[in-house]
Amino acid sequence: QECTKFKVSSCRECIESGPGCTWCQKLNFTGPGDPDSIRCDTRPQLLMRGCAADDIMDPTSLAETQEDHNGGQKQLSPQKVTLYLRPGQAAAFNVTFRRAKGYPIDLYYLMDLSYSMLDDLRNVKKLGGDLLRALNEITESGRIGFGSFVDKTVLPFVNTHPDKLRNPCPNKEKECQPPFAFRHVLKLTNNSNQFQTEVGKQLISGNLDAPEGGLDAMMQVAACPEEIGWRNVTRLLVFATDDGFHFAGDGKLGAILTPNDGRCHLEDNLYKRSNEFDYPSVGQLAHKLAENNIQPIFAVTSRMVKTYEKLTEIIPKSAVGELSEDSSNVVHLIKNAYNKLSSRVFLDHNALPDTLKVTYDSFCSNGVTHRNQPRGDCDGVQINVPITFQVKVTATECIQEQSFVIRALGFTDIVTVQVLPQCECRCRDQSRDRSLCHGKGFLECGICRCDTGYIGKNCECQTQGRSSQELEGSCRKDNNSIICSGLGDCVCGQCLCHTSDVPGKLIYGQYCECDTINCERYNGQVCGGPGRGLCFCGKCRCHPGFEGSACQCERTTEGCLNPRRVECSGRGRCRCNVCECHSGYQLPLCQECPGCPSPCGKYISCAECLKFEKGPFGKNCSAACPGLQLSNNPVKGRTCKERDSEGCWVAYTLEQQDGMDRYLIYVDESRECVAGPN
């Protein structure tokens, strides 16, 4: 978790800064010159800086669910949820959907009455009883209604010759009604006789081009709930046709340019203004159907199935069934489509402000799981088998109290979600205790909130009557320095350092001379990043296990050990697993020093005293030659031949040991003493 904060001076502002931010309410947590914003940081950082766990304010998002058992059967539970949302931190709750048997249904039968549907109309006229009987097998409360459509009554959609407008059918003897866009014939009713009677009066009509004005008619069915008689129950719209459909833009062909407005325009049960408004777009219609919870069933002939399947991909909770050429199978088709629609459950929410984000995890009964989706989705849902959705709601800022609803599309049940902000800190010191603030303010989350005219960490500073010069002196490092290093304000003789706009940069110190960002970088991050070390006033303080000026190294010495496992042979220090040798000694292990002066001359007196107990060091040889150890056997190393104090040549070998000026010395038994002149 990170905590990126800008100009934080209270616990609330801290909590608003992000889900990783926490506030330390500990008294005297800040040192001289420290801004209050250092109280706001991640939990680990505050703990590391000495804030006790129970002094850390970290309000969390939470959900409270509430069942409401008044009313009939409920398919969704709970009925109400209250969320307390902290910005950036999700609150989650479960919604269970249990599909009920016998849920009430309103079914509106919308039929294409263009001439090719003649035999279909004959069959539908006899259908009322069968249709209601079929509904009653599914539900205890079913109602049916009827409407019909042809197309807009302008060229090129219909033939506008006056004779053709009176009787658009190709067969003049056929009794045929004039074309129309949409006629609402029968309001939703449970009276099958009324259905039979009203539909029985309908006459076939006709138009010119193949596509029909079905989307116009569907839009009116959705936009006129009172006229159609929709109840707040499952709403099915059966759309029966044997051809395609016009959509937005096609109106231009008939000089109709005004976009469809999605409103109800029924006059005397006719859509009389269809020649004023263009056809709706598919998206606009999908929107209107979903808004009014209407599920369309497209009952279409075989050649049109593919076209309408494409349409169902855009319209949520819609189905396609293949209609026989004479509509004789329509009851069977509706039953199948209804079962298909009822077994697919989409969980969705209504419009939300940008400050709220909702995602769904769907745990379906067939073992399928969908995570982090914009809506819940389960298929194959069976009656009385519960399925669970986990809903996660996140606020991007401290929101205003509000509510939204969640519904299963096509079903009437809803879950009401109340959303409240979780931005206040319930600090234990809010007792209005004024003593800690010199009686000139009260304590709020560890900070003194001073009365007007007082200032300072403990409201100890009265602003009136004191010159700024008097106070400024203690805000300068010396007379040549600028006040608070130019990075803070001198308040009552104390530097209040500015809050930086740079994420992660904290300005602090008695004179605001320090910050947490101007240190060496490694891998593009200050002190190698928060996992390796922290920047304190220009120097990296590495966490255990790391070292280096930018905490760039993992602490290990394996690469610095010579064959005797001595670090840098005792002639250097191991940094970042590489030797830093004393001057002259060579990497990798500081064993050789090609440029060092010969040690032979330096140790002749030691050779003399160690071997022969003579010479200037004869009396205190061990003190004068502490780094040398005499060997009785020859050694490998530098061979020396030097004159001793008596003028004799002494041959000896120096084998360097680990460390500085440490040798094993082997001295030849015989000295070469040249006799002096006689």
Epitope: C264, A290, E291, N350, A351, S403, F404, V405, R407, I414
Partner: nanobody, 114 residues
Framework: EVQLVESGGGLVQAGGSQKLSCAAS???????MGWYRQALGKKRVFVAS???????IYGDSVKGRFTISRDNAKNTAYLQMNSLKPEDTAVYVC?????????WGQGTQVTVSS
């Protein structure tokens, strides 16, 4: 799409009662109806709301004093306000939530005199 008409505002004595109505008309299924209020120079704040299934929510400042109800058949929401205080003085605005958007009324003034 949806038109809202509020009524019932006016002048009332502190401690008294008042009932506001909000009637919705239009071509959209209304899910939630609610009341917000805005005092002079202040932000608009939530008062109460009621879902289509009767679930109610109240703002902290009115809990126990105000009651929201709804007649789904008439698409109308009511706000019964009891024990009114001077600080309840505000313009009370009705909001109706459709599936895709919310619709606001013009508001009705309620003045509580002490």
């Amino acid at each position: 799409e949806v038109q809202l008409v509020e009524s019932g505002g006016g002048l009332v004595q502190a401690g008294g009662s008042q009932k506001l109505s909000c009637a919705a008309s239009g071509s959209t299924l209304i899910y939630t109806m609610g009341w917000y209020r805005q005092a002079l120079g202040k932000k608009r704040v939530f008062v109460a709301s009621i879902s289509r299934d009767g679930s109610t929510i109240y703002g902290d400042s009115v809990k126990g004093r105000f009651t929201i109800s709804r007649d789904n058949a008439k698409n109308t929401a009511y706000l019964q306000m009891n024990s009114l205080k001077p600080e309840d003085t505000a313009v009370y605005v009705c909001k109706a939530e459709g599936w895709y958007q919310g619709y606001w009324g013009q508001g009705t003034q309620v003045t509580v005199s002490s």
